[in-house]
């Protein structure tokens, strides 16, 4: 990971919610589900109602970074995806409202969102060389790449 001090002076200001109620599927077509309260995992679902629906909020960097910086929230909740360390599960953090400004250690709530065709990648702002990833028989975690799966398809407007 990048040294944390490199990031600590950058300030991120909330702009707006840019996507509502979408599902994330990994490259194996597994959907992200909420398991055991504060964890996420991936599973092949017969019923997409069991998949987590996410909202995505956009932030603007004081560094005027060209990257799109986002926060991920479970729709209709106050639970936000929070990065830990490499190979550690991402957690769901409860907050009363979406943070208006994020800086320092709070950047574990933020991800750089990159798209390449239909593939979507979410890199941790706190750990810029680690991605949100799925891993066989494990939780959704932060990983640098294979064998973890780091590319996702966004499914929008699921009934």
């Amino acid at each position: 990971s990048a040294p944390f001090s490199f990031l600590s002076n950058v300030k991120y200001n909330f702009m707006r919610i840019i996507k509502y109620e979408f599902i994330l599927n990994d490259a194996l077509n597994q959907s992200i589900i909420r398991a055991n309260d504060q964890y996420l995992t991936a599973a092949a679902l017969h019923n997409l109602d069991e998949a987590v629906k996410f909202d995505m909020g956009a932030y603007k960097s004081s560094k005027d970074d060209a990257k799109i910086t986002v926060i991920l929230r479970i729709s209709k909740t106050q639970l936000y995806v929070t990065a830990q360390d490499e190979d550690q599960p991402v957690l769901l953090k409860e907050m009363p409202e979406i943070p208006k400004t994020i800086t320092g250690s709070e950047t574990n709530l933020l991800f750089f969102w990159e798209t390449h065709g239909t593939k979507n990648y979410f890199t941790s702002v706190a750990h810029p060389n680690l991605f949100i990833a799925t891993k066989q028989d494990y939780w959704v975690c932060l990983a640098g790449g294979p064998p973890s799966i780091t590319d996702f398809q966004i499914l929008e407007n699921q009934a």
């Epitope: 055991n36 964890y39 479970i74 639970l79």
Partner: antibody, heavy 122, light 107 residues
Framework: EVQLVQSGAEVKKPGVSVKVSCKAS????????MHWVRQAPGQGLEWMGW????????TYADDFQGRVTFTLDTSTSTAYMELSSLRSEDTAVYFC???????????????WGQGTTVTVSS | DIQMTQSPSSLSASVGDRVTITCRAS??????LNWYQQKPGKTPKLLIY???RLHSGVPSRFSGSGSGTDYTFTISSLQPEDIATYFC?????????FGQGTKLEIK
């Protein structure tokens, strides 16, 4: 096929404890929380609490706090509920139930054990 | 804690009737409302989740609606096999309270 199989009926004297087991099969045990719900004769469903099958942490309903303990044996995919200081009002059917989140926000119990009858009588 | 108030506590209806049960939460539960069916001597069974979504294998005569604090469960045409007690349950936040139940009988 998801199955929750509970231990058999128990008859206990007041003041002692009872331990009910719930063996899960057909899914990854540590992915979904396990809940315990009881039903006194002719009464409704009473949520007792749940156990996080990954961390082992439990949350108990206020009415059972201090008297109930949930435990796990992940090697056999089994959850346990122990209720102590039994009294006649604890005579009930005890169910285990697997929890699931729909959309990541709405919680339901979509698979249930067959129930274990516990009778407390002197 | 969120309290769930279910009504009526019992009702009697004829085969083919439309049957309605209501459930009121003590605060907004954002559609996180489930309905269960329990036949005599059997285990409870999830029928409807998230207010209106039918669990797999549940007949389409069962339906649910509502929002905020007020929710309704309907059987469009009562069948003899629907004799059971029905419970609502909020799935918004711990503790996951159930309603008191509605015992449904055939006239």
């Amino acid at each position: 096929e998801v199955q929750l199989v509970q231990s058999g009926a128990e008859v206990k004297k007041p003041g002692v404890s009872v331990k009910v087991s719930c063996k899960a099969s057909g899914y990854t045990f540590t992915t979904y929380g396990m809940h315990w719900v009881r039903q006194a004769p002719g009464q409704g469903l009473e949520w007792m609490g749940w156990i996080n099958t990954y961390t082992g942490e439990s949350t108990y309903a206020d009415d059972f706090q201090g008297r109930v303990t949930f435990t796990l044996d992940t090697s056999t995919s089994t959850a346990y509920m122990e209720l102590s200081s039994l009294r006649s009002e604890d005579t009930a059917v005890y169910f285990c139930a697997r929890g699931i989140y729909y959309y990541g926000s709405s919680y339901a119990m979509n698979y249930w054990g067959q129930g274990t009858t516990v009778t407390v009588s002197s | 804690d969120i309290q769930m108030t279910q009504s009526p506590s019992s009702l009697s209806a004829s085969v083919g009737d439309r049957v309605t049960i209501t459930c009121r939460a003590s605060q907004d539960i954002s559609n996180c409302l489930n309905w269960y069916q329990q036949k005599p001597g059997k285990t409870p069974k999830l029928l409807i989740y998230y207010t209106s979504r039918l669990h797999s294998g549940v007949p389409s005569r069962f339906s649910g609606s509502g929002s905020g604090t007020d929710y309704t469960f309907t059987i469009s045409s009562l069948q003899p096999e629907d004799i059971a007690t029905y419970f609502c349950q909020q799935g918004k936040t711990l503790p996951y309270a159930f309603g008191q139940g509605t015992k449904l009988e055939i006239k």
